[in-house]
Interface confidence: low
């Protein structure tokens, strides 16, 4: 059966361009190896924002140069996307894959609409 993935419908990024949300997946049994991918959907195009594989023993680890950070706890993954600007406003989809042990399962959330508002420039002080 397709794995259910839940994520919030809407998140507002902070003034510093940071957005956090929880991605929760439902599965029977504990996967030893899980891969989480954040995809951004713009129209019919889907692009990968970041991805990380984690195991029961190891913490969720994105690449050093990734725009994402995260922590995992059971079937929940706390994702944080950094460096967002107004132009990055869009639908961010959480894809979860249970890689090991078999069987392979994959699920995609309905997406989190992240709104990013560029901060107003500070007025010059005389």
């Amino acid at each position: 059966k397709g794995m259910h993935v839940a994520q919030p419908a809407v998140v507002l990024a902070s003034s510093r361009g940071v957005a956090s949300f929880v991605c929760e997946y439902g599965s029977s049994g504990n996967a030893a190896e899980v891969r989480v991918t954040v995809l951004r959907q713009a129209g019919s195009q889907m692009t990968e924002v970041c991805a990380a594989t984690y195991t029961v023993e190891d913490e969720l680890a994105f690449l050093d140069d990734s725009t994402c950070t995260g922590t995992s706890s059971g079937n929940k993954v706390n994702l944080t996307i950094q460096g967002l600007r107004a132009m990055d406003t869009g639908l961010y989809i959480c894809k979860v894959e249970l890689m090991y042990p078999p069987p392979y399962y994959v699920g995609m959330g309905n997406g989190t609409q992240i709104y990013v508002i560029d901060p107003e420039p500070c007025p010059d002080s005389d």
Epitope: K1, G2, M3, R35, T37, E97, M99, Y100, P101, P102, P103, Y104, Y105, V106
Partner: antibody, heavy 120, light 106 residues
């Protein structure tokens, strides 16, 4: 280019064992599970099981437990399937197969097949 | 285990005509994968993840479906399409293949 090259056809006597090899090249052997599939003459495909070459952990179709044993030799990037207590019902072509992508599971690459015949 | 039943068992189609093969699963699956096999050859990945054509597969082919009912369609059959087509599920172990559908040309 990903290649899976299997050992040649075998003719065995009933009760004997046979070990079929599948040599992998063109990718990092330990990155992908190796699955094995059976096709009896004129029949559909039957999944036997798979092995994770990295951890050497296996998953078997209950139907083939005790019949097939899957192993790997990481040093030569070769997967093996041993069939024991052979009988006429084991006559088939046996394939090794590998997923097409680390994160999307489907059998994209197949060996050429090894015909195992059991005859007294 | 999930049983995959293909219909029809065989079909004979004239070149240029459409063709359709169904695969019914005994319980819901996430994706369906399809393979083509010609006599004396290994199976070839044909359509994966329900609707994605494998490399080199002509766009006359398409895959669709969800839950328990999946379909492989050919818009205009050509001589090279002859062979046996198998569906396969990987949602639960043991992995299972369909009964196969033999496509012949008239």
């Amino acid at each position: 280019e990903v290649q899976l090259v299997q050992s040649g056809a075998e003719v065995k006597k009933p009760g004997a064992s046979v070990k079929v090899s599948c040599k992998a090249s063109g990718y990092t052997f330990t990155d992908y599970n190796m699955d094995w599939v059976r096709q009896a003459p004129g029949a559909s495909l039957d999944w036997i099981g798979n092995i994770n070459p990295n951890s050497e952990s296996t998953s078997y179709n209950q139907k083939f437990k005790g019949k097939a044993t899957l192993t790997v030799d990481k040093s030569t990037s070769t997967a093996y399937m041993e069939l024991s207590s052979l009988r006429a019902g084991d006559i088939a072509v046996y394939y090794c197969t590998r997923d097409g992508n680390r994160y999307d599971a489907w059998f994209a690459y197949w060996g050429q097949g090894t015909l195992v015949t059991v005859s007294s | 285990q999930i049983v995959l039943t293909q219909t029809p068992l065989s079909l004979s189609v004239s070149p240029g005509e459409p063709a359709s093969i169904s695969c019914s699963a005994s319980s819901s699956v996430t994706y369906m994968h399809w393979f083509q096999q010609k006599p004396g050859q290994s199976p070839k990945s044909w359509i994966y993840s329900t609707s994605i054509l494998a490399s080199g597969v002509p766009d006359r082919f398409s895959g669709s479906g969800s839950g328990t009912d999946f379909t492989l369609k050919i818009s205009r059959v050509e001589a090279d399409d002859a062979g046996v087509y198998y569906c396969q599920q990987r949602t639960s172990y043991p992995l299972t293949f369909g009964t196969g559908t033999k496509l012949e040309l008239k």
